[in-house]
């Protein structure tokens, strides 16, 4: 195999692989016909100038997870055929300005997870064929204007997890072919108007986990092909009217973990491909009529962990396909009887951890397919007669942690609960709060001795009319829905803390998270 170095393996197809901590210097001599060279998990700290002179046919060079801290300016001389270069997961702090001048046919350049503190303006000036540039996980405090100007073929750029606090509005102006731009995990507080205007082919924009406070009204107006927009875990307090109006292809939008106080009518849409919208962990206090009216394909709407005290009767207009609505952990005291009227396909509604004092008898009137209702931890003393009677598919109803008043008015609810005890689950049953004589007793099995007929609840009633729920959840509820934030230690944890592995930490949700 043309002199394969002893510490490497070489295949007859010109593939060379050198791995292991015992390698402390560049192996040599390398076979002259090598087309792919991988140097992985070694203790190589330096790349001299002369090591690749004799392997001009090299197409792919992968030097990852080494101790590489120093690269000589002419290290890649004579590698004119190189298409793919990865120097990821090393200890590079600086790159010689002319390091890449002889590899002008590169298509992918991976520099992620190093310690780069700056990029020279001319660093990438010869890369007209470059398609992918990964700079994730460095220490770049700012991106010089003009540094990407020659990357006219670039389709994927990852600048995530660096330290930069601002962007020049012209930094991306020549990247008309860019499709994926990842800027997450930086310290951006403001994005100048026009920053993304040249990116007409952009399909994914990741801005999550920055410190963005405001969005310019027309920030995304030239990005009509955008399909994924991640804005979660920022400091956004306001969504300008029309901010999302030019995004007809959007199918993923995350806004959780911001400081949103209100939503203007129609701010979302039209977005016919959006199926799930996460707005939890904001400061939203009220929802106006038609807040989501353009989202006619939305299936999941998560508004938990806000400060909602008022929901307009028409707030959910247009959400004809909504299946899951999460309103838990807010400040709701009252709900209008028509608030859910347009939600004909709703299956799960979570209203736990609010301050609801009563529910209108008609609140679920048009929502015949409801399967789970979470009402625990509110201020409910009773419920209207027949409120659940038409809900034939209801298989999970949580009513515990409410101050139930077990006087004669509770009898209809008591009777219904006895007949439908299986729907209450087995974890926690509703308990009487007053009068004092029955405080702490289960509302389901209490002997109700009021003026009027006495009702003794059977321990395990036979419920002949109970629907077949063999395929329904028994006790897991809407409370384990899609909430995707860092963990907290309170009772309503939103996420298991999951360390990122290979840049791919999962959306973690816990049963307790109540989403």
């Amino acid at each position: 195999y043309y002199g394969c170095p002893s510490e490497c393996t070489c295949s007859r197809a010109s593939q060379v692989e050198c791995t292991g901590a015992q390698i402390v210097a560049m192996p040599s001599p390398l076979p002259w016909n090598a087309m792919s060279l991988q140097i992985l998990n070694t203790h190589i700290t330096e790349l001299p100038e002369d090591k690749f002179l004799n392997i001009s046919a090299l197409i792919a060079l992968k030097m990852e997870k080494n101790e590489l801290a120093n690269i000589m300016p002419g290290a890649f001389r004579n590698l004119g055929s190189l298409r793919h270069l990865s120097l990821a997961n090393n200890k590079l702090k600086n790159l010689p300005v002319r390091l890449f001048q002889d590899v002008n046919n590169l298509e992918t350049l991976l520099l992620s997870n190093n310690q780069l503190v700056q990029i020279q303006p001319a660093q990438f000036s010869q890369f007209s064929n470059l398609k992918e540039l990964q700079l994730y996980g460095n220490n770049l405090e700012y991106i010089p204007e003009g540094v990407f100007d020659h990357l006219v073929g670039l389709t994927k750029l990852n600048l995530g997890n660096n330290g930069f606090t601002h962007l020049s509005p012209r930094v991306f102006q020549h990247l008309g072919n860019l499709q994926v731009l990842r800027l997450y995990e930086n310290r951006l507080s403001d994005i100048p108007m026009g920053t993304f205007d040249a990116l007409g082919n952009l399909q994914e924009l990741a801005l999550q986990e920055n410190q963005i406070g405001t969005l310019s009204p027309g920030l995304f107006h030239n990005n009509r092909n955008l399909q994924r927009l991640y804005l979660s875990n920022n400091h956004i307090s306001h969504l300008p009217p029309g901010i999302f109006m030019q995004l007809p292809h959007l199918n993923k939008l995350t806004l959780f973990g911001n400081s949103l106080k209100e939503l203007s009518p129609g701010v979302f849409g039209p977005m016919p491909n959006l199926r799930e919208l996460w707005l939890y962990n904001n400061h939203i206090t009220s929802l106006p009529d038609n807040a989501f009216s353009h989202l006619n394909q939305l299936q999941v709407l998560i508004l938990s962990h806000n400060q909602l005290s008022y929901i307009s009767p028409g707030a959910f207009n247009g959400l004809t396909n909504l299946r899951e609505l999460s309103l838990h952990t807010n400040a709701l005291q009252d709900l209008d009887g028509n608030v859910f009227r347009s939600l004909a396909n709703l299956r799960n509604v979570s209203l736990q951890n609010n301050r609801l004092r009563q529910l209108p008898g008609s609140i679920f009137a048009n929502v015949n397919g409801l399967m789970t209702i979470q009402l625990q931890n509110n201020n409910l003393e009773n419920l209207p007669l027949g409120i659940f009677d038409h809900l034939g598919n209801l298989c999970e109803l949580r009513l515990y942690d409410n101050p139930w008043r077990c006087d004669s008015n509770i009898l209809p609810l008591h009777d219904w609960l006895i007949l439908n005890r299986a729907r209450l689950g087995t974890d926690t049953l509703p308990v009487c709060s007053s009068p004092a004589s029955v405080r702490g007793q289960s509302l389901v099995i209490i002997n109700v001795n009021f003026p009027g007929p006495s009702v003794q609840g059977p321990e395990t009633p036979e419920v002949s009319s109970y629907p077949d729920t063999s395929s329904y959840p028994d006790s897991t509820s809407i409370s384990s829905t899609t909430e995707i934030t860092r963990s907290t230690d309170d009772d309503y944890t939103d996420l298991n803390t999951i360390e990122p592995i290979d840049d791919r930490n999962t959306w973690g949700m816990t049963d307790a998270q109540s989403g």
Epitope: E204, Q299, R347, N496, T506
Partner: antibody, heavy 122, light 107 residues
């Protein structure tokens, strides 16, 4: 270890029904979206249906819409596929898979079951 | 729906060869593409996600590239266990369509 095990497959007549189950273990089931994928004999893979971790969002291929129903029971770490009005062209190995995704570019069916065979024939 | 096509549908190669499989989407899917390997009688196994990222535990001879509509899977040096079928799949939007597959056979 992380594992998915399908069951419920078998021989059924056209127009009949079948209910597939998938038992998950080794990971927090309620953290993940789940999916069904099928593979007809000597054919390629076909995505059938996906369900969000809470069960709120549900997606179907056009070829099964209105006939198949996906559901999950997070308390039992189980995924289900109720198949009604079965046709000969539904004959396939049915796999359940964990759909893992995040906002950093990870999108994949990263864990698969071994599959269960469904044969629709008179 | 997004239609995924793969080429070639089958290819013959030898142990040690470098092979490239192409996957094309009918419309732009950014980099929301995964590659799977399936051995006969077994479930598929994830190789590549995000078009070019190697799944943990997958040998480094596998690599992916591309974004938008054109994607490639490259096996830098075929081993005997690599002579199986490979599928691409898009995750950009529902339905999450697969390519028809490419069978890699021994020459």
């Amino acid at each position: 270890q992380v594992q998915l095990v399908e069951s419920g497959g078998g021989l059924v007549k056209p127009g009949g029904s079948l209910r597939l189950s998938c038992a998950a273990s080794g990971f927090t089931f309620s953290d993940y979206y789940m999916s069904w994928i099928r593979q007809a004999p000597r054919k390629g893979l076909e995505w059938v249906s996906s369900i969000s971790n809470s069960g709120g969002a549900i997606y179907y291929a056009d070829s099964v819409k209105g006939r198949f129903s996906i559901s999950r029971d997070n308390a039992k770490n189980s995924l289900y596929l109720q198949m009604n009005s079965l046709r000969a062209e539904d004959t396939a190995v049915y796999y359940c898979a964990r759909y893992n995704w995040n906002d950093r570019g990870y999108d994949a069916f990263d864990i698969w079951g071994q599959g269960t065979m469904v044969t629709v024939s008179s | 729906d997004i239609v995924m096509t793969q080429s070639p549908s089958s290819l013959s190669a030898s142990v040690g060869d470098r092979v490239t499989i192409t996957c094309r989407a009918s419309q732009g899917i950014s980099s929301a593409l995964a590659w799977y390997q399936q051995k006969p009688g077994k479930a598929p196994k994830i190789l590549i996600y995000d078009a070019s990222s190697l799944e943990s535990g997958v040998p480094s001879r596998f690599s992916g590239s591309g974004s938008g509509t054109d994607f490639t899977l490259t096996i830098s040096s075929l081993l005997p266990e690599d002579f199986v079928t490979y599928y691409c799949q898009q995750f950009n939007s529902y339905p999450h369509t697969f390519g028809p597959g490419t069978k890699v056979e021994i020459k």
